[in-house]
Interface confidence: low
């Protein structure tokens, strides 16, 4: 009686159970009543990461430097290449198929969280008492200069983009 289901690591074909090809190998011929499944190893820069009946191995992911990618972990016949982004870039998705440059925080905004290989810069508006006068992917908001501690007075108020301007106190004559 022909089987209707097969054991783990087997597949049903032509009313018989054939062995799947092991990771790193692809299917060339199904088994017959006389022969076992015929499998061949994946070529260079190819892989298959499961027990399978694939007739083609998958190409290793290409970490294209034109897209800002570099190899984090080289692929094998059983694993895909893992890409990450060049310094200063981060992945656009979990699969890291392309990268975008870290954004800079504009004047008036400071860096709340510095970008990583997988997340962009997080900016925050500079609150009262703080400023940022540069466009930067690293700089936080800086506190206004404290004129009092320098025995000076505020001559020009600070903004979220400019520091206060200190000056000498008027001397009473």
């Amino acid at each position: 009686e022909p089987p209707t289901a097969c054991r783990e690591k087997q597949y049903l074909i032509n009313s018989q159970c054939c062995s799947l090809c092991q990771p790193g190998q692809k299917l060339v011929s199904d088994c017959t009543e006389f022969t076992e499944t015929e499998c061949l190893p994946c070529g260079e820069s190819e892989f298959l990461d499961t027990w399978n009946r694939e007739t083609h191995c998958h190409q290793h992911k290409y970490c294209d430097p034109n897209l800002g990618l570099r190899v984090q972990q080289k692929g094998t016949s059983e694993t895909d290449t893992i890409c990450t982004c060049e310094e200063g870039w981060h992945c656009t998705s979990e699969a890291c198929e392309s990268c975008v440059l870290h954004r800079s925080c504009s004047p008036g905004f400071g860096v709340k969280q510095i970008a990583t290989g997988v997340s962009d810069t997080i900016c925050e508006p500079c609150p009262v008492g703080f400023f940022s006068n540069v466009s930067s992917a690293f700089e936080k908001c800086h506190p206004w200069t404290s004129c009092e501690t320098k025995d000076l007075v505020v001559q020009q108020a600070g903004t979220n983009k400019t520091d206060v301007v200190c000056g000498p106190q008027d001397r009473l004559r």
Epitope: Y62, D64, N66, L67, G88, S98
Partner: antibody
Amino acid sequence: QVQLVQSGAEVKKPGSSVKVSCKASGGTFSSYAISWVRQAPGQGLEWMGMINPSGGTTSYAQKFQGRVTMTRDTSTSTVYMELSSLRPEDTAVYYCARGFRMDQWGQGTLVTVSS
Amino acid sequence: QSALTQPPSASGSPGQSVTISCTGTSSDVGAYNFVSWYQQHPGNAPKLIIYDVRKRPSGIPDRFSASKSGNTASLTVSGLQADDEADYYCSSYAGNNEMVFGGGTKLTVLG
């Protein structure tokens, strides 16, 4: 080694459109962006924009925004650049090149705009 | 996007060195280490000779070297040869998925 082969020369009338193709072979089509660059006779290189074949996302230079359209056909590993409302000053050799770094170039397509 | 500024011409005798500058702004050359240089012989497509400021694609001789300081990138061709006579273009990433080229420099090998 990626090879980029472009379509042949075109002569167009002012006000019309031109569509230049760039067929890629060798390497995985969806794993690299394609830039388009033009060069007017005796002039320098001018970056027009790019298309990422994997998702079809595009980015165009401000100068060409609204006049250029870049598309791709993954079944034939071909990208296209269409430029509309042609004027005589669009007469140039149009190149496709691989990625932002433009490490591989097509042979170029001469587009002549003349009445 | 304004073009990067290159000298229109440069020259040198065989065996000498010549340096070509490429000046941009703090939004392009100064902002990113993504400067490339191309060599173009008459009637041919450009050819990448330097990328990421100073890296050479395999097959490009080490007579070609490059660097960057502030908003200016430089290409140096040493041990000049007759075949180095060509147009040279710089390009830089300019943010927002845009590239910008220099106006080009015609390099003449004297003699």
